[in-house]
Interface confidence: low
Amino acid sequence: MEPLRLLILLFVTELSGAHNTTVFQGVAGQSLQVSCPYDSMKHWGRRKAWCRQLGEKGPCQRVVSTHNLWLLSFLRRWNGSTAITDDTLGGTLTITLRNLQPHDAGLYQCQSLHGSEADTLRKVLVEVLADPLDHRDAGDLWFPGESESFEDAHVEHSISRSLLEGEIPFPPTSILLLLACIFLIKILAASALWAAAWHGQKPGTHPPSELDCGHDPGYQLQTLPGLRDT
């Protein structure tokens, strides 16, 4: 595959009159990455899912959900050509549609699961554009997509690449940050114990200052709950 074909343009815009549906556009045959930001504190401990909706009021049929163990949500889970991964600290759910096809177009939802209920994080309209480098009959893309220029739309450009077979995705920033924080806490705890022993004090009288291990100010490291299936 030539490098040019690995460049994926991702157009994101808010649809007026479509109940805050965010539009993501991808090119047929390439990959499309959909991101759904959310409040990581509000949705702490919850698994996430990606479902396809039949019309605005129709049922939302589950396509793929994050790992059964919430702590392992950063691990990419596949269902066919659709992958899901959750940056639980950063508060970003990412869905990858590999080898995008005309039939992938439609209304979707990013969901946060709790019990048998599901909260909608974002409504997404996936639009599939014909590949300008593919000279097959455009009849394959029989439903119309956006083909005009997007002068009024807020456009984000995203460069993406396909994951090769066996390639291990790099962990999300938040996971690395979490590990770093745990390492720092261990060092500080050891230092505190050492200092307490040195001064003949009981451990814990001078706790280490709070660490900000979140992406935003005010996000403090919380004790992680035990491994559980929420």
Partner: antibody
């Protein structure tokens, strides 16, 4: 509840242009989860898809009719239209407008249809 | 073009009978197939989408199955109000419809 209503002349002369309009009520034509279609049915025969239009104005047509078909949208009037040029008696049919679910081939809401006869 | 061959073209059955209609695609269309019901003088009405999913509000006696090239539409217990013509429609490429099956009551 979205409803569609076709309107236009019931009689068109051969070689002229057939023009029909579909008015959408009970919902916005600009809703991004849908596209808008024209389908026709020859007397006593099956259904034939003519083409689709999206709220943005982008279109796709049946290859067999492509050279003669133009579908347009007027979001301010909540309408979309069909023009079929150089008509012959073979274009005599009931013409339906319908709403499709984007990404699905599902036509979930239909107009009641309008009969168009091509005759001199 | 993908051709959709529907059979039979017409059938007559008694109230309560199980009615089966088949639709064959000229090439593999996965599950990209819908079924519609059209009553005389009316517009078609969606019954089944994606080969086997029942549209909201449609009675459960209607069902669909199949994948690839061969599809089946079934009315488990024919009712008088089911008198209509039934069409299959593929959407693997641009939509094409089957020729229709006219269902009558004996």
């Amino acid at each position: 509840q979205v409803q569609l209503q076709e309107s236009g002349p019931g009689l068109v002369k051969p070689s002229q242009t057939l023009s029909l309009t579909c008015t959408v009520s009970g919902g916005s034509i600009s809703s991004g989860g849908y596209y808008w279609s024209w389908i026709r049915q020859h007397p006593g025969k099956g259904l034939e898809w003519i083409g689709n239009i999206y709220y943005s104005g982008s279109t796709v047509y049946n290859p067999s009719l492509k050279s003669r078909v133009t579908i347009s949208v007027d979001t301010s009037k909540n309408q979309f239209s069909l023009k079929l040029s150089s008509v012959t008696a073979a274009d005599t049919a009931v013409y339906y407008c319908a709403r499709g679910l984007y990404g699905y081939g599902v036509l979930d809401v239909w107009g009641q249809g309008t009969m168009v006869t091509v005759s001199s | 073009d993908i051709q959709m061959t529907q059979s039979p073209s017409s059938l007559s059955a008694s109230v309560g009978d199980r009615v089966t209609i088949t639709c064959q695609a000229s090439q593999d269309i996965s599950n990209y197939l819908n079924w519609y019901q059209q009553k005389p003088g009316k517009a078609p009405k969606l019954l089944i989408y994606d080969a086997s999913n029942l549209e909201t509000g449609v009675p459960s006696r209607f069902s669909g199955s199949g994948s690839g090239t061969d599809f089946t539409f079934t009315i488990s217990s024919l009712q008088p109000e089911d008198i209509a013509t039934y069409y299959c429609q593929q959407f693997d490429t641009y939509p094409t419809f089957g020729g229709g099956t006219k269902v009558e009551i004996k």
